[in-house]
């Protein structure tokens, strides 16, 4: 069973998650369209269902393309350059998902704009902390 | 290896009707744009319009909007163009070329060797 | 639409010799106030299907010998190559992909004197 202090540290590690989430939604929203509009274009893969932490493996399996369209579209927008950004992103998520069990994901077939992929990872880590707390 | 591999060469009469293909192989074909460019004989190359097999999004230049149907069918890894009736001027050879996973932040690196089609009567 | 101008249509070279192809935009390529250049050059060589040589300005693409280099900003291009070889010889476009729709310039075919 969790301890508290685990289901704490999972917390923590979620906030951590959704902070670097929200601050890309930021720093994309920032861009003055044509800009915008041209990273749309960027398609994303989204989970059939994410509704515990093993589905973080959806997310992990798409961090490299997160990581391109970022250094594609580069911007002065965000403090940390993509790779490091990114790669807080996957030490986090590793953790969270664990390495004990693999999982396979399954992705739904209708594909996402980079927009609709982090309000869905940040809804999907809002919801995981509600339940923590 | 990474390749693209088109159907082979058409010989049509105006007003018929042709599809042609472009199969995938060595790279996630659901996760690439797949374009089209038409060269005519002796011109230079037109972007034709593209499309993104994993969902079917499809994008037309205006200037092929309505001429033209780009469709994939992604369990075979296969993206098409067609015509509903052909004229003379489609006579032409058309490429498919690969973009990425975004047209705009990609260049088109494989390239397909090219379908001829001979629209005569 | 984004109209791209490549200037000469037929360039003679000698090979061992430098040679340059410039290319003009009606607008401006580079994507946003702190971005790339959305600007790519492909070779057809003859009886061949297109290749791509230089991707958003100036990176080459894989397996592309150095003597290739694009370079330019704004609304001028340039691709260059160092010392022509024999097997450089066919038609050289630019293409934008700033704007839909993705437009090409209209060729320029280098040929050995």
């Known amino acids: 069973a969790p301890t508290s202090s685990s289901t704490k540290k999972t917390q923590l590690q979620l906030e951590h998650l959704l902070l670097d989430l929200q601050m890309i939604l930021n720093g994309i929203n920032n861009y003055k369209n044509p800009k915008l509009t041209r990273m749309l274009t960027f398609k994303f893969y989204m989970p059939k269902k994410a509704t515990e932490l093993k589905h973080l493996q959806c997310l992990e399996e798409e961090l490299k393309p997160l990581e391109e369209v970022l250094n594609l579209a580069q911007s002065k927008n965000f403090h940390l350059r993509p790779r490091d950004l990114i790669s807080n992103i996957n030490v986090i998520v590793l953790e969270l998902k664990g390495s004990e069990t693999t999982f396979m994901c399954e992705y739904a077939d209708e594909t996402a704009t980079i927009v609709e992929f982090l309000n869905r990872w940040i809804t999907f880590c809002q919801s995981i902390i509600s339940t923590l707390t | 290896e990474v390749q693209l591999v088109q159907s082979g060469a058409e010989v049509k009469k105006p007003g018929e009707s042709l599809k042609i293909s472009c199969k995938g192989s060595?790279?996630?074909?659901?996760?690439?744009?797949i374009g089209w460019v038409r060269q005519m004989p002796g011109k230079g190359l037109e972007w034709m319009g593209i499309?993104?097999?994993?969902?079917?999004?499809?994008r037309y230049s205006p200037s092929f909007q309505g001429q033209v149907t780009i469709s994939a069918d992604k369990s075979i890894s296969t993206a098409y163009l067609q015509w509903s009736s052909l004229k003379a001027s489609d006579t032409a050879m058309y490429y498919c070329?690969?973009?990425?996973?975004?047209?705009?932040?990609?260049?088109?690196?494989?390239w397909g060797q090219g379908t001829t089609v001979t629209v005569s009567s | 639409d984004i109209v791209m101008t490549q200037t000469p249509l037929s360039l003679p070279v000698t090979p061992g010799e430098p040679a340059s192809i410039s290319c003009r935009s009606t607008?401006?390529?580079?994507?946003?106030?702190?971005?790339?250049?959305?600007l790519d050059w492909y070779l057809q060589k003859p009886g061949q299907s297109p290749q791509l040589l230089i991707y958003?300005?100036?990176y080459r693409a894989s397996g592309v010998p150095d003597r290739f280099s694009g370079s330019g900003s704004g609304t001028d291009f340039t691709l260059k190559i160092s010392r022509v070889e024999a097997e450089d010889v066919g038609v050289y476009y630019c293409?934008?992909?700033?704007?839909?729709?993705?437009?090409f310039g209209g060729g320029t075919k280098v040929e050995i004197k």
């Open positions: 070329a690969r973009q990425g996973r975004s047209y705009h932040y990609y260049g088109m690196d494989v």
């Open positions: 060595g790279y996630s074909f659901t996760s690439q744009w």
């Open positions: 499309i993104f097999p994993g969902d079917s999004d499809t």
């Open positions: 607008q401006s390529l580079l994507d946003g106030d702190d971005g790339n250049t959305l």
């Open positions: 958003t300005l100036s």
């Open positions: 293409m934008q992909r700033l704007e839909f729709p993705l437009t």
